[in-house]
């Protein structure tokens, strides 16, 4: 498919001009953020954005790359270096360490210095490294989480917790001997470890007593609490403050929003993690954007400002599953969730950036044509004499031997939601990759986001912008009109 | 591995704080630039980018990924959107065209807007776009082009033809019915559609009559001429001008960089593309980084300043075979020849952009650690019980079923030169990726390469630093003391 | 012109050593891969060992019949490739070729070869 | 490793008769092979390279084809000269010989 307009020159000269007069008008802000706003997209490598902005764009009928994400539109980009400490290749909860408290760990610990080892309670304390967030709710901001995975995943937990073992959910997942040693488990650490204003996500199960029934789901025994400790959770973060309020549902979180009375908010819509947006509930679980709105309703009442983290948690259990469908997919909820967001906030005063934690070994190849589906598959044949997808893992479930030989497969086959994408190497789970993610920033201090740099960057530049500390003493000028 | 520095917060807070204030020092120049080089990866995407800095570190005896590629250090980044016209996935045809001339073609075509048709000879008059390259020189700036593939190959080519089919390399390759069309082989091209300062590659066999022996091996018939027209377009070119000199060994190229009668110089090295650095004869072949300082030297005898195309062209050769240690020990030979350029250039006057044509499926996985070999095996075992590399394939020629199996693989075995690493599917050779590629920008403007571009941009920007059609009416101040 | 000369063989008795050397001229010795292939009588030809180019490390290979028993090595310094051969056994017996790779179309096709020395294991 | 099945072993022609010698390799080779002659008391000499590719001097009656794992050395129409015996190598992935194949005249 060749669009005629693209068939002259002056379309393309045209637009360069434009993009070149753009990037002429660009003034750095001198001012300093009163908001700052991460976007976390886990699992969204560079591979990953540019599948999903041809989804997206074929989604609004278009032929999909010339079209543009939201994350596109921000006029700074950086390439962040993702290793952990003691990996190559990292997990969620030494990257989140890295761009949410601004010093690398080891792997699978959060919030920890790489001076604490994965698994050793007693390597936790004195490693502690302290978050954005906490600093910004210090400096009286309003901070909160949103995610869709559970709010006691590895890139959440980032902001709050403190944890040699990034799968300590509940105290039911810790072992008695950590639990003796005083670790405390993630779930504990949201409610205790600081002030969240708003928490919005998956993850009820950890937060009350084994035996108790979830409310969406009362006759699934494996959907109820897990704590073994007889805490609720939810019960003691009420207690903490007058206007805090509980939600399960999308309805509550929609009235609650809108309540004036309503000063801190925590809504768990599923027992774990969300459901992927192709199979949610709308009249139960919130979408991504509908939770990103609900927190910049209630934090932008704050006039001193907010942070506000903001994850499309599950692109990365797509990957993992080797289902591409549902890890772009999520990949555009996430997009829309950033569009929503600044619609509802000012780039005058508000710094926003959209990362990844890491990256995939999903890559988008084989000569197809423009405009043909992003799950489709490669002109031509292999090797083989069998088709093959454009979309494919470098390992992962995928990988399947029928009689000793690759699985032919067709259009209707690979665009399906369930298809998984074949792989060289077969794995139980599809792991990350190590190669540099994309960082997008716009907002005061967001010309900062510059070439290439450590994933302990961003957190700087968060602190920096908003003159948090250690950047106290930051010499930026409040944005004309900014309240305290 | 863990360096004990590393383990300690304040390493990675001083470190942030230090990029931090390179950043707050981040001026954008308001100056033309003078000098324009372009350094072209071909198919280096940014996982290629990532495995070659830790291969470039740990040949340093560090542990890789904390180190610094030369691109690394160039101040500004952008993404670039690489798609062709017909093809979400492009070529180096019609990505040439993109970057060197700033409109998109068509998939396989060279210096031809989208009105163009691949092999059809017939659609090229009047589709004809003009290169930067071209534009520099009628400004009168010097002008030169290095690869280390056939200096006739689709990248370089972008500079100065125009061809319905890149694989016209010589009129042997160019059907009799489109040569009476009048459509001219590249090689015809390379010397007669503009005066080109410097030439310096492979890409012998192209210029001479057939039947005329190699110099190099002169015995060998299928690496003598191919010309079909009886011309001998070297000793044409050699005519054009004064100065002119002809080299094909290292020893005549060095000889002739520092001969300051020489205006004008042709290098070619091979009949075809040059050797992979790993295979070259240093006696006989210069690397391309000593391309590079040649090049460097003849150019910028000019006050008025020069255009240069780099090529490292052979990244995307060792991707096509599957064999990463060809791909990433030429990222590496490309990333010396950019510090070189730096060592031999300023960047008060020189705009410097490094960027891909293209990616490739090519990814690096399996959470290995930090300073093991980016050619080994990931920790633990696959599904069938066999080991497995870090870097992989989704397609390509490494694809080999054992006994209707998956083979398995040493560490010895994944460390060779001449390993292919394993693929989701079998092909012949492995393909391009249609994901965005980094751009890298240093020098005057080289702050206008921001955010999500189109590849296009890429000719904009530097059209637009160096006051060139057809942004003549630029309004930059020429460099404090630049000569004309 | 390329030349490779090999010395070194001779009659040793079975479980002794003995180092084949080659010397090479006409070339830039460091920039290219070595190989050793061997041809006991009446059998046909067998590759030994490689050791790689200075670009890649001067790493090397083996076939499985001599790993742990043949050692590949050069002195690049003399433009030499040695094979250094222990534990020998009568079916070593064999002419032992030194060859040169080329990088044609690039592959490392062994291009070209020594005339080769004489190795009998017999007692 | 990568196996190469030669055949025939051996093979009686008789001048201008047109030869046929065939390599199967264990796995895809990607067209790195390569033909030798052979000739008693002397070194193994380079023919074709990279399937097809005639080495210098080699006279054109010689030629080869193949892919995947499939390879064929074709003499068009044999010569008292050629009398030897002929080997592949395939040199994708190391090196490995074929079995050889030796060629006599009738």
């Known amino acids: 498919i060749i669009p005629v307009e693209e068939e002259n020159p002056d379309f393309w000269n045209r637009q360069a001009a434009e993009a070149l007069g753009a990037a002429k008008k660009l003034q750095p802000a001198q001012t300093a953020a009163k908001n700052l706003i991460i976007f976390l997209g886990d699992g969204m490598g560079v591979s990953t954005v540019t599948a999903a902005r041809i989804l997206k764009g074929q989604k609004k009928d278009k032929l999909g790359p010339e079209t543009f994400l939201a994350m596109d539109r921000f006029p700074y980009v950086a390439l962040s270096k993702t290793y952990s400490v003691d990996k190559h290749v990292p997990d969620s909860g030494a990257t989140a360490t890295a761009y949410l408290c601004g010093v690398k760990g080891n792997f699978q610990t959060i919030g920890l210095s790489a001076a604490a080892r994965f698994n050793q309670c007693n390597t936790t304390r004195g490693n502690e490294v302290i978050s954005v967030m906490n600093r910004a709710k210090k400096a009286g901001k309003s901070v909160g989480v949103v995610t869709t995975t559970r709010v006691q995943h590895a890139s959440p937990a980032g902001a709050y917790a403190h944890t040699v073992n990034r799968n300590w959910y509940s105290d039911a997942d810790v072992p008695a001997s950590a639990r003796q040693e005083g670790c405390q488990d993630i779930a504990t650490q949201l409610i205790s470890n600081m002030d969240i204003d708003v928490i919005l996500g998956g993850g009820r199960k950890y937060m009350f007593p084994m035996g108790t029934p979830d409310p969406e789901y009362p006759d699934d025994y494996s959907q109820g609490g897990t704590r073994l400790d007889g805490k609720n959770l939810v019960q003691e973060w009420l207690a903490k403050h007058q206007g805090a309020r509980y939600v399960w549902n999308r309805t509550e979180l929609l009235q609650a929003s809108l309540d004036p009375s309503v000063t801190h908010l925590m809504g768990l819509f599923e027992p774990g993690d969300m459901k992927y947006e192709i199979h949610r509930d709308s009249t139960l679980d919130p979408s991504l954007m509908e939770m990103t709105e609900a927190a910049l309703l209630l934090l932008s009442r704050n006039p001193r400002g907010f942070f506000l983290f903001v994850e499309g948690g599950r692109i990365d259990h797509g990957h993992h599953e080797s289902r591409a469908y549902r890890a772009l997919t999520e990949t555009i909820m996430f997009d829309d969730a950033i569009e929503r967001a600044g619609q509802l906030t000012s780039e005058e005063d508000t710094l926003s950036l959209v990362t990844a934690d890491h990256s995939h070994v999903f890559s988008f190849g084989g000569y197809p044509l423009r405009g043909s589906s992003i799950f489709g598959l490669a002109p031509g044949k292999a090797r083989d004499r069998k088709a093959y997808t454009v979309l494919l893992y470098g390992n992962g479930p995928g990988y399947v031997l029928k009689d000793g030989a690759r699985p032919d497969v067709t259009e209707s086959e690979s665009g399906s939601p369930e298809y998984r994408q074949q792989s060289a190497v077969p794995l139980d789970g599809e792991t990350h990759a190590g190669e540099d993610v994309a960082v997008f920033a716009r907002g005061p201090q967001a010309h900062l986001v510059h070439g290439v740099q450590e994933q302990t960057f961003i957190a700087h530049v968060m602190a920096f912008a908003a003159c948090l500390e250690p950047y106290t003493a930051c010499d930026l000028a409040p944005r004309a009109g900014t309240t305290d | 591995i863990i360096p004990v520095e590393e383990e300690n917060p304040d390493f990675w807070n001083r470190q942030a704080a230090e990029a931090l204030g390179a950043a707050k020092k981040l001026q954008p120049a308001q100056t033309a630039a003078k000098n324009l080089i372009i350094f072209l990866g071909d198919g280096m995407g940014v996982s290629t980018v990532t495995a070659a800095r830790i291969l470039k570190g740990q040949k340093k005896d560090k542990l890789g990924p904390e180190t610094f590629l030369a691109m690394d250090r160039f101040p500004y980044v952008a993404l670039s959107k690489t798609y062709s016209v017909d093809k979400h996935v492009p070529d180096s045809g019609a990505t040439a065209t993109a970057y060197l001339c700033g409109v998109k073609g068509n998939f396989q075509t060279i210096g031809l807007s989208a009105a163009a048709r691949f092999n059809q000879c017939n659609t090229t008059r009047g589709n004809e776009v003009i290169s930067v390259m071209n534009r520099a020189k009628k400004a009168g700036k010097s002008v030169g082009v290095v690869t280390t593939t056939r200096v006739q190959h689709a990248s370089p080519a972008g500079a100065y033809a125009h061809t319905v089919n890149r694989n016209w390399y010589s009129d042997a390759d160019v059907p009799a019915s489109a040569r009476q069309e009048g459509c001219q082989d590249i090689a015809t091209q390379l010397i007669s559609n503009m005066d080109i300062d410097v030439i310096l590659g492979g890409g012998r066999k192209y210029m001479f009559p057939m039947g005329t022996p190699d110099p190099e091996y002169p015995d060998d018939y299928s690496q003598g001429g191919t010309r079909l027209d009886g011309k001998n377009l070297v000793q044409e070119w050699l005519a054009k001008h004064q100065g002119a000199r002809y080299v094909w060994n290292r020893t005549e190229l060095l000889q002739a960089s520092l001969d300051p009668s020489v205006t004008h110089l042709m290098g070619l090295f091979e009949p075809g593309d040059m050797k992979y650095e790993i295979h070259r004869d240093s006696t006989l072949d210069p690397s391309l980084m000593e391309m590079t300082e040649a090049a460097l030297l003849l150019l910028s005898r000019n006050p008025r300043g020069f255009f240069l195309f780099v090529e490292g062209g052979r990244i995307d050769h060792g991707h096509h075979e599957s064999r990463a240690y060809r791909a990433l020990t030429e990222t590496i030979m490309f990333d010396d020849a950019i510090e070189r350029a730096g060592q031999l250039t300023s960047e008060e006057d020189t705009l410097s952009l490094v960027t891909a044509d293209h990616s490739h499926v090519f990814s690096f996985g399996g959470y290995p650690l930090r300073g093991s070999s980016i050619f080994g095996l990931a920790p633990g075992k696959a599904r069938d019980r066999k080991a497995y590399t870090v870097l992989l394939y989704g397609n390509g020629p490494g694809y080999v079923l054992k006994d209707g199996a998956r083979p398995d693989v040493t560490e010895s075995e994944s460390g060779s030169p001449e390993y292919r690493q394993q693929s989701a599917v079998p092909l012949d050779g492995e393909t391009h990726a249609g994901e965005d590629v980094a751009v890298f920008a240093r020098g005057p403007q080289a702050h206008l390469v921001h955010g999500v571009q189109e590849q296009t941009f890429i000719a904009h920007v530097m059209a637009f630093a160096a006051c060139l059609e057809p942004y003549t009416a630029c309004d930059l101040a020429p460099r404090a003391g630049t000569t004309d | 012109e390329v030349q490779l000369v090999e010395s070194g063989g001779g009659l040793v008795q079975p479980g002794r050593s003995l180092r084949l050397s080659c010397t090479a001229s006409?070339?830039?010795?460091?920039?290219?891969?070595m190989s050793w292939v061997r041809q006991a009588p009446g059998k046909g030809l067998e590759w030994l060992a490689l050791?790689?180019?200075?670009?890649?490390?001067?790493?090397?290979e083996y076939t499985a019949s001599v790993k742990g028993r043949f050692t590949i090595s050069r002195d690049n310094s003399k433009n030499s490739l040695y094979l250094q051969m222990n534990s020998l056994k009568t079916e070593d017996t064999a002419v032992y070729y030194c060859?040169?790779?080329?990088?044609?179309?690039?592959?490392?096709?062994?291009?070209?070869w020594g005339q080769g020395t004489l190795v009998t294991v017999s007692s | 490793d990568t196996q190469m099945t030669q055949s025939p072993s051996s093979l009686s022609a008789s001048v201008g008769d047109r030869v046929t010698i065939t390599c199967k390799a264990s796995?895809?080779?990607?067209?790195?092979i390569a033909w030798f002659q052979y000739k008693t008391g002397k070194a193994p000499k380079l023919f074709i390279h990279?399937?097809?590719t005639l080495q210098p001097g080699v006279p054109s009656r010689f030629s080869g084809s193949g892919s995947g794992r499939d390879y064929t050395l074709t003499i068009s129409s044999l010569q008292p000269e050629d009398i030897a015996t002929y080997y592949c190598?395939?040199?994708?992935?190391?090196?490995?010989f074929g079995q050889g194949t030796k060629l006599e005249i009738k």
């Open positions: 060859a040169r790779a080329s990088f044609y179309y690039d592959g490392k096709v062994l291009a070209y």
């Open positions: 006409g070339f830039t010795f460091t920039d290219y891969y």
């Open positions: 050791i790689r180019n200075k670009a890649t490390g001067y790493t090397t």
């Open positions: 796995q895809d080779i990607n067209k790195y």
């Open positions: 990279y399937t097809s």
């Open positions: 190598l395939q040199y994708d992935n190391l090196y490995t």
